[in-house]
Interface confidence: medium
Amino acid sequence: LREKSEKFAFQAEVNRMMKLIINSLYKNKEIFLRELISNASDALDKIRLISLTDENALAGNEELTVKIKCDREKNLLHVTDTGVGMTREELVKNLGTIAKSGTSEFLNKMTEAQEDGQSTSELIGQFGVGFYSAFLVADKVIVTSKHNNDTQHIWESDSNEFSVIADPRGNTLGRGTTITLVLKEEASDYLELDTIKNLVRKYSQFINFPIYVWSSKTETVEEPLEEDETAQEEKEEADDEAAVEEEEEEKKPKTKKVEKTVWDWELMNDIKPIWQRPSKEVEEDEYKAFYKSFSKESDDPMAYIHFTAEGEVTFKSILFVPTSAPRGLFDEYGSKKSDYIKLYVRRVFITDDFHDMMPKYLNFVKGVVDSDDLPLNVSRETLQQHKLLKVIRKKLVRKTLDMIKKIADEKYNDTFWKEFGTNIKLGVIEDHSNRTRLAKLLRFQSSHHSTDITSLDQYVERMKEKQDKIYFMAGSSRKEAESSPFVERLLKKGYEVIYLTEPVDEYCIQALPEFDGKRFQNVAKEGVKFDESEKSKESREATEKEFEPLLNWMKDKALKDKIEKAVVSQRLTESPCALVASQYGWSGNMERIMKAQAYQTGKDISTNYYASQKKTFEINPRHPLIRDMLRRVKEDEDDKTVMDLAVVLFETATLRSGYLLPDTKAYGDRIERMLRLSLNIDPEAQ
């Protein structure tokens, strides 16, 4: 038979992967059974889905089950499912090439996980390469499969190469797949019924199909008495002194009780899904076990919610927040489908790849949704367009946000925000209808505390009596933000300033018109106003009048074409000056982000606009440099030294305000000239 089979080589990457699985999981061999059961369940899901729109799909075999049988004599373990089965072509492709197994990504993740010292056993399930874990315990794996569209075939491999042949026995399965493991000598424990039953119970708890193990049990049965035994009894009765009435004679037993070993299929799992049970009856440990089982994660979830939604659509759902963000959460954000939400209709698994079950920003949430109100006998494409899915999505988002809101403050700030803070910020940008709810979940660093993060609610609670705006300062780091000249006076006056240090932060705040009735004010832009008394207003106006010659000289002469206007600053206390963006110009931080993202490509209006966008130059009238400049300008407004000083101050302010200098060489030359002057060295001396 083997001579007639067609031989194949495994793809090189599959070989690499098998070695990796065997080397990294040799201490955790038992997971092979979890993977085989999981694959069987997937195959059953597929045929059940097909049967909804094809009435003949189950004709080959009406039952939907997984059956596991140990054969101690022959050293074999069989796992049989009545799932969709595989055609000859699929046996070759799915079990021998990279096409199906997601191998390259798996290899990368597996290597990363090993380097990070993380558990690798969950990864094989996540990447659909679990089948190969069979080689942890088997010298040889034989796959017999019957698909509705093909004859029955046998795939066989010793992990070095594989062969495929048409099954000479014909169709013995009806439909489905049997995986037969020829066990390694040291894996004979997996032929012990108790071992197998315990493992099956452990790994089949949340599989929604009946899983049976071929089991023996001792039963007491009544057997008819054999002839010699009957004769013996009659003899004993004849010796009896008392006569026995005829009717009593009828009652005499013609059978005996015998203990016998009976073999039958024993059901291993309670197939009522956990989400169908009332939440009051489900223990926390059960939720954790279910999460690990269905998500193929090794950690407990950070939070979960189990609910029944009623109204326009009725459905049951359990949603989970993982303890840590999946790797590559923002790789191809929005274009990569998330398969974390599994959709069931009337307990039938439909799909886990509907794009719109959750918005992109909640792409980390895992869970199940089971509805009786969606149609079963339609194509997935039709179902994806069903109007009730939008209602379900809306409720899932609300419930997810409820679940997140209920995470205890300490856990939220220390764990959730670190892992998923960016998702919440993207939610504020993307989800208009839930923006207010999401805004309450935002956390930022602020001047209130050197390390703790704050919510906007807490900020508003601490706002000063007449403060009507939420102040924020953006920078590439907290250090940069808190040492900015723009926050000097605010901090001195006891105002709290929020520090935005992530690239997405400023986008996020721009998407929030207000919070709790308070608008946001970027302190690096125009519009920062302080509540002032009549006396301080008079004092400010007098200062403005005093510095008018300097302000006009800067605008019209020294910094002509560089600034929009020069004004006396209300926000500076230490720094001599600062450069302030217009209301909707780029702040220094935004300019840095935009340039990093290479927005300025080609000759578009942004190049023209930002090249020509002049900023407001604010001066600190109390600073000795500024006071001295005023004196010098009054004396001689054509003084070359004071002209140079004005430009150096402008350029320094540009840098301190977070902007980039277009001409750093000229800046360096000017600084050198100023140094020469201060040290009385001839500016021309070589």
Epitope: Y333, K360, Q510
Partner: antibody, heavy 121, light 110 residues
Framework: EVQLLESGGGLVQPGGSLRLSCAAS????????MSWVRQAPGKGLEWVSG????????YYADSVKGRFTISRDNSKNTLYLQMNSLRAEDTAVYYC??????????????WGQGTLVTVSS | QSVLTQPPSASGTPGQRVTISCTGS????????VSWYQQLPGTAPKLLIY???HRPSGVPDRFSGSKSGTSASLAISGLRSEDEADYYC???????????FGGGTKLTVL
């Protein structure tokens, strides 16, 4: 030279679907916020939807929310608009437009010539 | 009904100065930049003014924009026959999370 070329318009029945494409050239497509703007016959301009350069974050006008999906393929320099459950009031010329200054939410500096979508039984 | 309000029509004779107004609210014009677009008959719109008052290169300085509070206006001086077109104002609306246009003003050169 910056060019935006829309395609995919045509006649469709109410309730039907259509997918519009906009092929971009002459600039680094992946650096720009892109939008769809429509104009019903004899009427004014109506912004339909916008999409961020890389994150895939999307915005929609209330009139199309839940029915239209904007997407982009930066490797193909193409913007898409998947329109489902079409109504007669969606009949319009659909323009693809480039927005260089998002997130300061500035203007559309380049527009395509438009593609006509007619929804009628 | 457009979020930004423009007069439906305006007219002037060649050489004259014409102003078109655009009124909104604090969530759009009040706190965001205004743009103006010109649409000649049978063509796609063209950007005329951005960031309230800036002209893209190639737009004649006869066109100017200004903004005050929640209103913006477009002024065209030295009117020419080729200026006959529809003019639209536009701005981002932070409450609607959408870009909004005015209803358009048809300018006729008499």
């Amino acid at each position: 030279e910056v060019q935006l070329l829309e395609s995919g318009g045509g006649l469709v029945q109410p309730g039907g679907s259509l997918r519009l494409s906009c092929a971009a050239s002459g600039f680094t497509f992946s650096n720009y916020y892109m939008s769809w703007v429509r104009q019903a016959p004899g009427k004014g301009l109506e912004w339909v939807s916008g999409i961020y350069p890389n994150s895939g974050s999307t915005y929609y006008a209330d009139s199309v929310k839940g029915r239209f999906t904007i997407s982009r393929d930066n490797s193909k320099n193409t913007l898409y608009l998947q329109m489902n459950s079409l109504r007669a009031e969606d009949t319009a010329v659909y323009y693809c437009a480039r927005d260089p200054l998002h997130p300061a939410r500035f203007p559309f500096d380049y527009w395509g010539q438009g593609t006509l979508v007619t929804v009628s039984s | 009904q457009s979020v930004l309000t423009q007069p439906p029509s305006a007219s002037g004779t060649p050489g004259q100065r014409v102003t078109i107004s655009c009124t909104g609210s604090s969530s759009n014009i009040g706190n965001n930049a205004v743009s103006w677009y010109q649409q000649l008959p049978g063509t796609a719109p063209k950007l005329l003014i951005y960031a309230d008052s800036h002209r893209p290169s190639g737009v004649p300085d006869r066109f100017s924009g200004s903004k005050s509070g929640t209103s913006a206006s477009l002024a065209i001086s030295g009117l020419r026959s080729e200026d006959e077109a529809d003019y639209y104002c536009g701005a981002w609306d932070a409450s609607l999370n959408a870009y909004v246009f005015g209803g358009g003003t048809k300018l006729t050169v008499l």
